[in-house]
């Protein structure tokens, strides 16, 4: 029961997190005009990953897309990439985790298969969350750097006769949405990985047994799902999630619930 709750909660938290990552990626307020200690402009500028907007005091808002790909800063492209990778991984993770949910029955899917799928989706959520957090943090760092550069320009660039109203940008709402959403996705992923431990079948003392069907043979191995599907993790993953490093042969010969973690 606790495992189902942990898995279900992990799924819901990740779902909210991924929705948040998508929302943050689409939002226009990644950076907003800094109004503190600034000549008060009658227009309010804000920028997103895909377009920049200007809101006049009347409420009239005009947005312009970044219609160039090569002309954009490399950092902005990197942030876009990180956010998209995060969304894609999260979406795949959600798809996998739906089938992995203990409360959903699909044919005669074994618990070992569900455990593997839960682990896979958990890892995907963790990576998705990290991508979002990294993307938002890179953008935030870019803003901080530009903010102090423009602040320096404000106080050094007064030599000429004609001045420009310096527009400085500070953190927009999307950054906070992104950080929170990334964190939620990460937490959801960890919960899925924890749930995976409890989903794996209890330790058994028999080795793999082959059952021969008519015409061709299909091997059903307790704990062998890892070897026969794409959802399993390799020996490297064993070292990360398991206490000990064993060979694949040992894994298949002596299955235990820890092999699924």
């Amino acid at each position: 029961m606790a495992v189902t709750a942990c898995q279900g909660l992990g799924f819901v938290v990740s779902l909210i997190g991924i929705a948040g990552i998508i929302a943050a990626t689409c939002m226009d307020q990644w950076s907003t005009q800094d109004l503190y200690n600034n000549p008060v402009t009658a227009v309010f500028n804000y920028q997103g990953l895909w377009r920049s907007c200007v809101r006049e005091s009347s409420g009239f808002t005009e947005c312009r897309g970044y219609f160039t790909l090569l002309g954009l800063p490399a950092m902005l492209q990197a942030v876009r990439a990180l956010m998209i990778v995060g969304i894609v991984l999260g979406a795949i993770g959600l798809l996998v985790s739906i089938f992995a949910l203990k409360c959903i029955r699909i044919g005669s899917m074994e618990d070992s298969a569900k455990a593997n799928m839960t682990l896979t989706s958990g890892i995907m959520f963790i990576v998705s969350g990290l991508c979002a957090i990294a993307g938002v943090s890179v953008f935030a760092n870019m803003l901080v750097t530009n903010f102090w550069m423009s602040t320096a320009n404000m106080y050094t660039g007064m030599g000429g006769m004609v001045q420009t109203v310096q527009t400085r940008y500070t953190f927009g709402a999307a950054l906070f949405v992104g950080w929170v959403a990334g964190g939620l996705t990460l937490i959801g992923g960890v919960m899925m990985c924890i749930a995976c431990r409890g989903l794996a079948p209890e330790e058994t003392n028999y080795k793999a047994v082959s059952y021969h069907a008519s015409g061709h043979s299909v091997a059903y191995k307790p704990g062998g799902f890892k070897a026969s599907t794409g959802f399993g993790s390799n020996t490297k993953n064993k070292k990360i999630y398991d206490g000990g490093a064993r060979t694949e042969d040992e894994v298949q010969s002596y299955p235990s619930k820890h092999d699924y973690v």
Epitope: P39, V40, T41, A42, V43, N45, Q47, S52, C53, V54, E56, S57, S58, G59, F60, E62, R64, V162, Q163, T164, V165, T167
Partner: antibody
Framework: QVQLKQSGAELVRPGASVKLSCKTS????????IHWIKQRSGQGLEWIAK????????YYNEKFKGKATLTADKSSSAAYMQLSSLKSEDSAVYFC?????????????WGQGSSVTVSS | DIVMTQSPSSLTVTAGEKVTMSCKSS????????????LTWYQQKPGQPPKLLIY???TRESGVPDRFTGSGSGTDFTLTIDSVQAEDLAVYYC?????????FGGGTNLEIK
């Protein structure tokens, strides 16, 4: 059609106060900024302040802070400007005007002006 | 505050002539976010309130004759009247609509011979 009707001419003593009104019609009063502009006889225009009637939010020209106070009455769709501690240099025509939507913060409709004369 | 300087302060022309008046701002009125200049032109006829002619430095207000053209960017702006008519007798003001407080130029008084 959009109309802004201002109160009539005022003759006031130095040190006194005066409250000018600007009654609007023909549009949704609460969703457009109302600006107040001063014009001394034969001189240029001077921006005083503006108010957003929907929220009562205001922006003042530092020069007129303490001199002008802007208010708005949603029920009567009227904007008001109170001028206090009047001096001879406050003698001028005061215009109220509506800020247009999507017109680069420009004012597109003006009242006819209220003349204020400060004299002892 | 942004200082708006208009020149000439007075101008006398013959009907049908082309007129150009200038407006300079002490700071740029260009907003990079939407690539627009927040400069407005008004026409004030004697005994009347000002009338909006041009906003965003070059966008003509509806109902304004197309002989009125606004141009310029950053700090230098121009209002051109292609073929002056008798009814164009007025004072023309430019206004900074980019920062608070909004500031007006001293005006250009257009007189017709």
């Amino acid at each position: 059609q959009v109309q802004l009707k201002q109160s009539g001419a005022e003759l006031v003593r130095p040190g006194a106060s005066v409250k000018l009104s600007c009654k609007t019609s023909g549009y949704t009063f609460t969703t457009f900024w109302i600006h107040w502009i001063k014009q001394r006889s034969g001189q240029g225009l001077e921006w005083i302040a503006k108010i957003y009637p929907g929220t009562g939010y205001t922006y003042y020209n530092e020069k007129f802070k303490g001199k002008a106070t802007l208010t708005a009455d949603k029920s009567s769709s009227a904007a008001y400007m109170q001028l206090s501690s009047l001096k001879s240099e406050d003698s001028a025509v005061y215009f109220c005007a509506r800020e247009g939507y999507g017109k680069g913060n420009a004012v597109d409709f003006w009242g006819q002006g209220s003349s204020v004369t400060v004299s002892s | 505050d942004i200082v708006m300087t208009q020149s000439p302060s007075s101008l006398t022309v013959t009907a049908g002539e082309k007129v150009t008046m200038s407006c300079k701002s002490s700071q740029s009125l260009f907003n990079s976010g939407n690539q627009k200049n927040y400069l407005t032109w008004y026409q004030q006829k004697p005994g009347q309130p000002p009338k909006l002619l041009i906003y965003w430095a070059s966008t003509r207000e509806s109902g304004v004759p197309d002989r009125f053209t606004g141009s310029g960017s950053g700090t230098d702006f121009t209002l051109t009247i292609d073929s002056v008519q008798a009814e164009d007798l007025a004072v023309y003001y430019c206004q900074n609509d980019y920062t608070y407080p909004s500031t007006f130029g001293g005006g250009t008084n257009l007189e017709i011979k």
